[in-house]
Amino acid sequence: GYKAEVMVSQVYSGSLRVLNRHFSQDLTRRESSAFRSETAKAQKMLKELITSTRLGTYYNSSSVYSFGEGPLTCFFWFILQIPEHRRLMLSPEVVQALLVEELLSTVNSSAAVPYRAEYEVDPEGLVILEASVKDIAALNSTLGCYRYSYVGQGQVLRLKGPDHLASSCLWHLQGPKDLMLKLRLEWTLAECRDRLAMYDVAGPLEKRLITSVYGCSRQEPVVEVLASGAIMAVVWKKGLHSYYDPFVLSVQPVVFQACEVNLTLDNRLDSQGVLSTPYFPSYYSPQTHCSWHLTVPSLDYGLALWFDAYALRRQKYDLPCTQGQWTIQNRRLCGLRILQPYAERIPVVATAGITINFTSQISLTGPGVRVHYGLYNQSDPCPGEFLCSVNGLCVPACDGVKDCPNGLDERNCVCRATFQCKEDSTCISLPKVCDGQPDCLNGSDEEQCQEGVPCGTFTFQCEDRSCVKKPNPQCDGRPDCRDGSDEEHCDCGLQGPSSRIVGGAVSSEGEWPWQASLQVRGRHICGGALIADRWVITAAHCFQEDSMASTVLWTVFLGKVWQNSRWPGEVSFKVSRLLLHPYHEEDSHDYDVALLQLDHPVVRSAAVRPVCLPARSHFFEPGLHCWITGWGALREGGPISNALQKVDVQLIPQDLCSEVYRYQVTPRMLCAGYRKGKKDACQGDSGGPLVCKALSGRWFLAGLVSWGLGCGRPNYFGVYTRITGVISWIQQVVT
């Protein structure tokens, strides 16, 4: 029987260049008569052009919605009603070809052509893109607040904020022909619900979305986005009503930056340089293609690529890479943003060198990618450490912490978190190494204590990069490093002359001179610890709520003991900078650390002194009794304590804590507490210090109060941020 043909709506968006007209500012105002008259003429021309081709039978509707420079560019959309079976045959490329063919056929024609009555259309300036009904609806919703801006070379144009009476606005941006646009977005409020989407074309085409950002992101207070060319659209959707713009937008044209390099690496290990996408840290542009060729000096070496918060993964089924495509020695890999460090190790088998390609496969992009490159020894990739095949990183082996996600760094250990005697492979505790008393059968624990040794898990690395065998040699009054660097920066960790955490006791003035009280509007919120003259360390989760993210809210008190009264020894500071660890993850509490820069340096006194920071290799022995301090609640759900409380807790091995917490404990966490509960941190202690006393009498920061199940509950230990796991970030920031 007869079957009616199914027709479908196919939507196209595009632009065309008119050579015999010039753009004027009047055409940016939709309410102007110039705009209305030009739109009517351009619309008529567009319809006539389409209907002059074999597309005419499918023509449904069209609209010219905007104009731009060049001499005059018209931006439009149109809909064709086409039989379903012809849908694929009328791709944007085919439609563009048909229209260009029509334009070319009449260029030298003397015959009267309707669409050429007023306009001389440039066939080379026609662009047709795929669109959808949804895209047109999104575009139409912005037309009441539509801003066109042309930005010239060398200009930085600050865009006028949105019209707050509108619910959505669109900035249509255009720059000089052979340049690319760089948009800068800066969030100016601590919290908002506004949404901004950036497109690589003149209108909000979902398939050409570069990125979208939402709600005054604290993770990215400033975002720079690159278009692939000289046109870009930014769409704003209103969040909460506000009289202040929660963001500032500015745009500038930039030249295309070549992303190709040939490098020959030196005959040395470790990082030798940086490769990055153009205009890093800007988002890479939708048509980025980088090609880096690296030549390795010898086949003894492999090439290592160290990434920050970005990893490479094999992609199944040849699906497109959504976060960047990499090809390394003909292997296709996809980039993936992660909250961890990562290294890709490339074995070198030929002297021809290695070519690394990076391509943005789709229009959706992301933060610029930067990678440190260097060499590693193929026969011993991680001297003294373990190569974690999961993430390519060198991690400490047999230290009692599963640093590698598969835990292989803690497998097959003869001595875990202890020293292995040479004589008979017996294990002795680390504090007994180089303590002047032989504990191994032939005294191998006391050998090489005055000389450099190969670096390993528990060796201390001196400033000159040599290593010493003695565990925890920092600030013990005896120089162990040739350069004396183990005794530098030692004005720390000493208690003042002095004599409620759950199960605790009241502290006295000067007993914990590094203890900080972090307050908002006179109310104690979190603890912290002074680690340098202008830096206080605390937990990142203290700033989890958007309302707590602004530095202006916080006051830091040092030298404080009582919350309800002040004494002469205490001092207060405003916060000039707040830095959360870039890998901090709220849900898992991983990397739960933040640094506060004080508005002026501290003046040290008996009541105000920094705590000592441990080296990455510092070993806090499980079983050791350390102390936590704070003004947190004295019982679960109770009010905070008036007096600074102190309580001793025992350090718990990682594997035991991990079992108790059903494997939610990461290598950046450390556990402490007791079977009986009773002694524990509680609400309000967050970010406060867990300190351990070294044999020298100095106190070292082992952890920060992070999380736990309730307070002082039996069978559940307190979980702390492990300082040795985040020390490299701390040192990077503070120095």
Epitope: E621, Q650, L656, Y674, K676, N715
Partner: antibody, heavy 119, light 110 residues
Framework: QVQLVESGGGVVQPGRSLRLSCAAS????????MHWVRQAPGKGLEWVAI????????YYEDSVKGRFTISRDNSKNTLYLQMNSLRAEDTAIYYC????????????WGQGTLVTVSS | QSVLTQPPSVSEAPRQRVTISCSGS????????VNWFQQLPGEVPKLLIY???LLPSGVSDRFSGSKSGTSASLAISGLQSEDEADYYC???????????FGGGTKLTVL
Amino acid sequence: QVQLVESGGGVVQPGRSLRLSCAASGFTFSNFDMHWVRQAPGKGLEWVAIISYDGSDKYYEDSVKGRFTISRDNSKNTLYLQMNSLRAEDTAIYYCAKDGYGSSLFDHWGQGTLVTVSS
Amino acid sequence: QSVLTQPPSVSEAPRQRVTISCSGSSSNIGNNAVNWFQQLPGEVPKLLIYYDDLLPSGVSDRFSGSKSGTSASLAISGLQSEDEADYYCAVWDDSLNGVLFGGGTKLTVL
């Protein structure tokens, strides 16, 4: 490699005293709470006393309170039990036991020393 | 008389599963971690389960512990003749400020 070795047991008359020692090795003695546990012949286990890692806290089973004293010397890695006014019902094997991490009870035990109170 | 109650004896055939209970009160089992010990004839007690349900390294996973409210239990599956021993539960008691042992359960593998 944790080792606990008790000594000092023997036969003693009622009312007399005895001092038990427990030499510890293979772990950092000063980090862990220590206990004495006893077992009368053919009977079950009975806890006697505990001392905290730094010696600051001590607790006793009711029947030995005032007669027994637990102590430790962390510099010598040794645990002691001073038993005074001994009674026949104190006859038992006395074990010294080490707490585990977070004060988990008795993760290692000594071999025990027999104390016999008899006239 | 022990405040922690255990059955004096249990018996089961080889390869079967047996459960030993230990009941106490809120001041001990209800609020603290339970440990289980095995004492083979003529030997020193050995830690079998700690923190209610954790196995020390070297202990067979045929042993498992659990706790609910003021009662705890030890389960042994795939019984073997070498499992014949006395089994004790132990827990800290907050009101006594001391450790309580159960009276012990003698396991016989038939």
